[in-house]
Interface confidence: low
């Protein structure tokens, strides 16, 4: 069956790294420079991705695979296949239209990317603050005072149901 199909379509014989050249009687021609074909039987080669500006080349383009980009120092990748480079900030900061800004009081960011998120509210889980939060670190919750007093139940009641906070990045 495969052989019959290849007789009907000579292009199916062209391997990755080549294209079926209609201008040359459907001969398999190598992909031109800066182009590739990752599968066989293709009638054109795709243009290689160029890693320019804030993008830098992580993997060079070959005749059978596209180039892969990452970001120059001070930037980080976002999106599938590093479709975006976003400026790094320091821990304790977030990126805004005006550049990197310190997290407001009551919020933190422990990464070089993303947004400042509110400190955990320990009291919602019936706990107390063991270690105070900073711009770079969340608070650390400890056992509630009631848990430490004699005669307290060892069964912790479930936390009240609440909508998880969104912090898209």
């Amino acid at each position: 069956f495969e052989r019959t199909r290849s007789l009907q379509d000579p292009c199916s014989n062209c391997p990755a790294g080549t294209f079926c050249d209609n201008n040359r009687n459907q001969i398999c021609s190598p992909c031109p420079p800066n182009s590739f074909s990752s599968a066989g039987g293709q009638r054109t080669c795709d243009i290689c991705r160029q890693c320019k500006g804030v993008f830098r080349t992580r993997k060079e383009c070959s005749s059978t695979s596209n180039a892969e980009c990452d970001c120059t120092p001070g930037f980080h990748c976002l999106g599938a296949g590093c479709s975006m480079c976003e400026q790094d900030c320091k821990q304790g900061q977030e990126l805004t239209k005006k550049g990197c800004k310190d997290c407001c009081f009551g919020t933190f960011n422990d990464q070089k990317r993303g947004i400042c998120r509110p400190w955990t509210n320990c009291s919602l889980d019936g706990k107390s603050v063991l270690v105070n939060g900073t711009k770079e670190r969340d608070v650390v919750c400890g056992p509630s005072p009631a848990d430490l007093s004699p005669g307290a139940s060892s069964v912790t009641p479930p936390a009240p149901a609440r909508e998880p906070g969104h912090s898209p990045q």
Partner: antibody
Amino acid sequence: EVQLLESGGGLVQPGGSLRLSCAASGFTFSSNEMSWVRQAPGKGLEWVSGISWNSGSIGYADSVKGRFTISRDNSKNTLYLQMNSLRAEDTAVYYCARDRMVRGVSNWFDPWGQGTLVTVSS
Amino acid sequence: QSVLTQPPSASGTPGQRVTISCTGSSSNIGAGYDVNWYQQLPGTAPKLLIYGNFNRPSGVPDRFSGSKSGTSASLAISGLRSEDEADYYCQSYDSRLSGSVFGGGTKLTVL
């Protein structure tokens, strides 16, 4: 009055290149994020690329990644889109728009330019 | 295929109320990203109609309202008028794609 005016569209052969420009006026261009959005004839809207106020954050749709390059010149209040290796499916009206980004959960486009038509055909 | 799903068409008679839906997923609307709506009159550029789920820019009549719940959003137009005949698009941000995404658009016909 806030205004955006695109230029640079036209007829180009497959594999060719074009550079679109968008001249901004009536607002502080240098502190606003900007985007390009396109609309193929009779089709819907597709976000193409976006750039932050200082070019520190740049993004592309998968369909144009590696072929298109967005840039801006804040001293000239102008946004650019360099389009290489053009394909028939890139035929569309290209709009530039101010991207009102509220980092975290919201971004919207307002205002929009009138658009410039790019036709890729042999 | 658009990342956000809208009905291709909707219709109503003058004075009626019509609703246009926009359905997304856990990487866009469901992730907490806001939804915005645009009106595109024939032969013109899109115009912002609703931003941040329910806010109206100045100059947009209060006949237009927006809402969002879970992974979907809606645009409602009350007291339908002939000049409302246009294409309507929803838009949000997608964390998986790291970019803005649009619905396929809904053509509103005023009968």
